[in-house]
Interface confidence: low
């Protein structure tokens, strides 16, 4: 069994469905946009065959007009835009989403370079960041089970249109901070994270800004272990390494563990001429281990120092709980220190037991 | 070895309150996540609760909401469900079982009986 | 009503394969793991199978589990008079925040 069955991405945690029918949404554009209609099947399920209308009237589609199952964009969008739209299915002509579009003449994304001319007050609708779709947010806490996707969304709007920002547990939040990453999708006013882990429970805040004014929306994520499972192995980790006579080395081993993991660190050796023995075991030697002090941010860390060519070889880190093992491998090459260093192949085997 | 332990079930009337234990043992409680499960006699059986390892999440089936409040104690290694305003259809054995997103392991159950 | 549907009943005859199905929606079977309980009669339930398919340790190979889209089975071969017990499916449900069962399959040995 490998490890990628325990890592898999399950699916992306469930949405909030879209508004009932009967409830019509209020959506404001300004002229030049893209406007963009989304209708997800209700409940998540199929929806079957679907038909967009504008103002009681089927949309043709064209190359201003895009129709999709789901989702509608008219782009550079004018005064005649404006109307009752709605996503029905083709066969009962039920509606699914029901939008009212109005589109201003000004456009909604300010041109200001440095932010400091206030907008004149000509009327149109200029002012502080507004949510346009405030049902989609009513769910302010998401459980899922580890490796989950997971998507945070806090769409608005506001004339000059505002900025989005996001803060994990009120601090900022980058794509660094996490491994992995994650994907911020401006346009959709949303924040992803792939495969998410127990590190990843917490709040997180949106904030969304113009000159105007500012919103924010916080989320509580949490998630949850995916119990029985051994520990998972962070992808890639440790790597392989190629490092030159008598420098220092690291590797790096990331493991989750929702029961308490024991963790070591180990080399492989010959033993006879032999890597492995009878039974297929590999012969190895332990180079770390739990100890009295040792922490677990401390074993996830393999310091090789002044290296020597009898240090080059196959790494194993290896990470057990309760339930089971997992292990990652990577190798060590070490040249003379005459020669240039040659980049080591990049993928580190990976093994599960 | 593993062991969940319940206590505090009986008979109770309707309105009542009833204070259900799980004492655990066999494995380093303030890391998992734990769970309320119910069986009315006869039926199936009825996720009721669960607590998040620090008591920082907590979740409740919609028919208990309001009702039941799950809580633990780490340093005890013991798991409690505070059940108030109790009805006739609350009538159910309550398990204690290890785990969030799946049970691994159960308790034998406490039986709690809400009748005038 | 329970949220994850299995048929109440299910039957066969020692040797014979017998499969029990699950089946529930995207916020629950679709995107989450599928565990699998047994409740032999007047004990408390018992893990069977765990993230749609793995068998915890002590767990004959004769159990096995498999999820295609909203839907999950067990199956049971070599069936065996021991074998005879309530079966019950689970799965979180993201939608709901909680976890579900489905109404359980009481499984007879002829």
């Known amino acids: 069994e490998s490890l990628g069955t325990e890592q898999r991405v399950v699916g992306r945690a469930a949405e909030v469905p879209g508004p009932e029918p009967g409830q019509q949404e209020q959506l404001v554009f300004g002229s030049g946009d893209a406007v963009e209609l989304s209708c997800p099947p209700p409940g998540g399920g199929p929806m079957g065959p679907t038909v967009w209308v504008k103002d009681g009237t089927g949309l043709v589609p064209s190359e201003r007009v895009l129709v999709g199952p789901q989702r509608l964009q008219v782009l550079n969008a004018s005064h005649e835009d404006s109307g009752a739209y709605s996503c029905r299915q083709r066969l009962t002509q039920r509606v699914l989403c029901h939008f009212s579009v109005r589109v201003t003449d000004a456009p909604s994304s300010g041109d200001d370079e440095d932010g400091e001319d206030e907008a004149e007050d000509t009327g149109v609708d200029t002012g502080a960041p507004y949510w346009t779709r405030p049902e989609r947010m009513d769910k302010k806490l998401l459980a899922v089970p580890a490796a989950n996707t997971v998507r945070f969304r806090c769409p608005a709007a506001g004339n000059p249109t505002p900025s989005i920002s996001w803060l994990k547990n009120g601090r900022e939040f980058r794509g660094e901070h996490r491994i992995g990453g994650i994907k911020l999708r401006h346009q959709q006013w949303s924040l992803v994270m792939e495969s998410v882990v127990p590190s990843d429970r917490g709040n997180y805040t949106c904030v969304v800004e113009n000159k105007f004014g500012s919103i924010r929306q916080t989320y509580t994520l949490d998630v949850l272990e995916r119990s029985p499972h051994r520990p998972i192995l962070q992808a890639g980790l440790p790597a392989n390494q190629t490092a030159v006579l008598g420098s220092d080395v690291e590797f790096h081993c990331k493991v989750y563990s929702d029961a308490q993991p024991h963790i070591q660190w180990l080399k492989h050796v010959e033993v006879n001429g032999s890597k492995v023995g009878p039974d297929g075991t590999p012969y190895v030697t332990v180079l770390k281990t739990a100890g009295a002090n040792t922490t677990d941010k401390e074993l996830e860390v393999l310091s090789l120092h002044n290296v020597t060519f009898e240090d080059a070889g196959e790494y194993t880190c290896l990470a057990g709980n309760s339930i089971g093992f997992s292990h990652h491998s990577a190798w060590l090459v070490v040249l003379p220190a005459e020669e240039e260093l040659v980049e080591a192949d990049e993928a580190g085997s990976v093994y599960a037991g | 070895e593993v062991q969940l332990l319940e206590s505090g079930g009986g008979l109770v009337q309707p309105g009542g309150s009833l204070r259900l234990s799980c004492a655990a043992s066999g494995f380093t409680f303030s890391n998992y996540y734990m769970s309320w499960v119910r069986q009315a006699p006869g039926k199936g059986l009825e996720w009721v609760s669960g607590?998040?390892?620090?008591?920082?999440?907590?979740y409740y089936a919609d028919s208990v909401k309001g009702r039941f409040t799950i809580s633990r104690d780490n340093s005890k290694n013991t798991l409690y469900l505070q059940m108030n305003s109790l009805r006739a259809e609350d009538t159910a054995v309550y398990y204690c079982?290890?785990?969030?997103?799946?049970?691994?392991?159960w308790g034998q159950g406490t039986l709690v009986t809400v009748s005038s | 009503q329970s949220v994850l549907t299995q048929p109440p009943s299910a039957s066969g005859t020692p040797g014979q394969r017998v499969t029990i199905s699950c089946s529930g929606s995207s916020s629950n079977i679709g995107n989450n793991d599928v565990y699998w309980y047994q409740q032999l009669p007047g004990t408390a339930p018992k893990l069977l199978i765990y993230?749609?398919?793995h068998r915890p340790s002590g767990v004959p190979d004769r159990f096995s589990g498999s999820k295609s889209g909203t839907s999950a089975s067990l199956a049971i071969s070599g069936l065996r008079s021991e074998d005879e017990a309530d079966y019950y499916c689970g799965a979180w449900d993201a939608s709901l925040n909680g976890y579900v069962f489905g109404g359980g399959t009481k499984l007879t040995v002829l």
């Open positions: 993230a749609d398919n």
């Open positions: 079982a290890r785990g969030g997103g799946g049970f691994d392991y």
């Open positions: 607590i998040y390892y620090g008591s920082g999440n907590i």
